[in-house]
């Protein structure tokens, strides 16, 4: 296999409104270097979601619970969860630059809110 | 069991040229970050150098950028520093190193050592 | 370049007592939770050997009285109890950003 792999083992999440919602990304490798951002939809209209680097993103934290040795663990829980949330998310791996440019994306976790 | 094994150190004259090799065996080698480590008595540990599993990717620090060259041929299991331009404080005994994630460095070699003087 | 300064240079402990070893790094090592903290064995003649990774996780084969813990800036690798065959130089290494770096090592040997 080729360079690094980028693993959303989840194809879908159902989270109920008000709660929190564990969205899981492992990455096989740290390189190419580059850092990892969370992006709702795909495209150019994509909505960024995460950026560990830079950028105010209150109800996002991160949640490492990975301590294998084969793959890191960058996967984020956002809190307080609404209607408005729905939709499919990407942890995708950057290649630093100037600009950084997209590397490798991650098959995408849709997340659908269920009614309290 | 894992093995790696360098060779090709030895005394060199400041700016001539060296290449190490680095032969793996007991992994699979084309999966893994390769890298070399130096170690010298005043310096201690200096990373050297990184080349991603598939050989596209290469990293070097300022001291030996533009110096050295990193490459890698999955088919041999091999890894190789060709080395130029070197200076006396390129002295230091040199280390073949794997890492898996290319974050630790999980594997290695016993070292090499590199002797630049007149 | 993050620069690691490991604490102290040299330490003797007692057999069975417990020895520890610090590693500051001049800016933060983690990223999405993970500490890029690693630590590893030196033996006089032999190469560096994995120990710790990613701060806390034992490497597989290596004795549980190995520790570390830590996050961010501020890292520590216990060994307790300790034993003979433990008299080695350890370092830190952090992988987080590059030019990746190490800490100047930290001789252990016993009182």
């Known amino acids: 296999e080729e360079e690094l792999q980028v693993i959303q083992p989840d194809k879908s999440v159902s989270v109920a409104a008000g709660e929190s919602a564990i969205l899981h990304c492992t990455v096989t490798s740290l390189i190419p270097v580059g850092p990892i951002q969370w992006f709702r939809g795909a495209g150019p209209a994509r909505e960024l979601i995460y950026n560990q680097k830079e950028g105010h993103f209150p109800r996002v934290t991160t949640v490492s619970e990975s301590t294998k040795r084969e793959n890191m663990d960058f996967s984020i829980s956002i809190s307080n969860i609404t209607p408005a949330d729905a939709g499919t998310y990407y942890c995708v791996k950057f290649r630093k630059g100037s600009p950084d440019t997209e590397f490798k994306s991650g098959a995408g976790t849709e997340l659908s809110v269920r009614a309290k | 069991e894992v093995q790696l094994v360098e060779s090709g150190g030895g005394l060199v004259k400041p700016g001539g040229s060296l290449r190490l090799s680095c032969a793996a065996s007991?992994?699979?080698?084309?999966?893994?970050?390769m890298s070399w480590v130096r170690q010298t008595p005043g310096k201690g540990l200096e990373w050297v150098a990184t080349?991603?599993?598939?050989?596209?990717?290469?990293y070097y620090p300022e001291s030996v950028k533009g110096r050295f060259t990193l490459s890698r041929d999955n088919a041999k299991n091999s890894l190789y520093l060709q080395m130029n331009s070197l200076r006396a404080e390129d002295t230091a005994v040199y280390y073949c190193?794997?890492?898996?994630?290319?974050?630790?460095?999980?594997?290695w070699g016993q070292g090499t050592t590199v002797t630049v003087s007149s | 370049d993050i620069v690691m300064t490991q604490s102290p240079a040299s330490l003797a402990v007692s057999l069975g007592e417990r020895a520890t070893i610090s590693c500051r790094a001049s800016e933060s090592v983690d990223s999405y939770g993970n500490s890029f903290m690693h630590w590893y064995q030196q033996k006089p003649g032999q190469p560096p050997k994995l120990l710790i990774y990613?701060?806390?996780n034992l490497e597989s084969g290596v004795p549980d009285r190995f520790s570390g813990s830590g996050s961010r800036t501020d890292f520590t690798l216990t060994i307790n109890p300790l034993q003979a065959e433990d008299v080695a130089t350890y370092y830190c290494?952090?992988?987080?950003?590059?030019?990746?770096?190490f800490g100047g090592g930290t001789k252990v040997e016993i009182k």
């Open positions: 990613r701060a806390s």
């Open positions: 007991g992994f699979t080698f084309s999966s893994y970050v």
């Open positions: 080349i991603s599993s598939g050989g596209t990717y290469t």
């Open positions: 190193a794997s890492q898996l994630t290319g974050s630790e460095f999980d594997y």
């Open positions: 290494h952090q992988s987080a950003d590059l030019p990746w770096t």
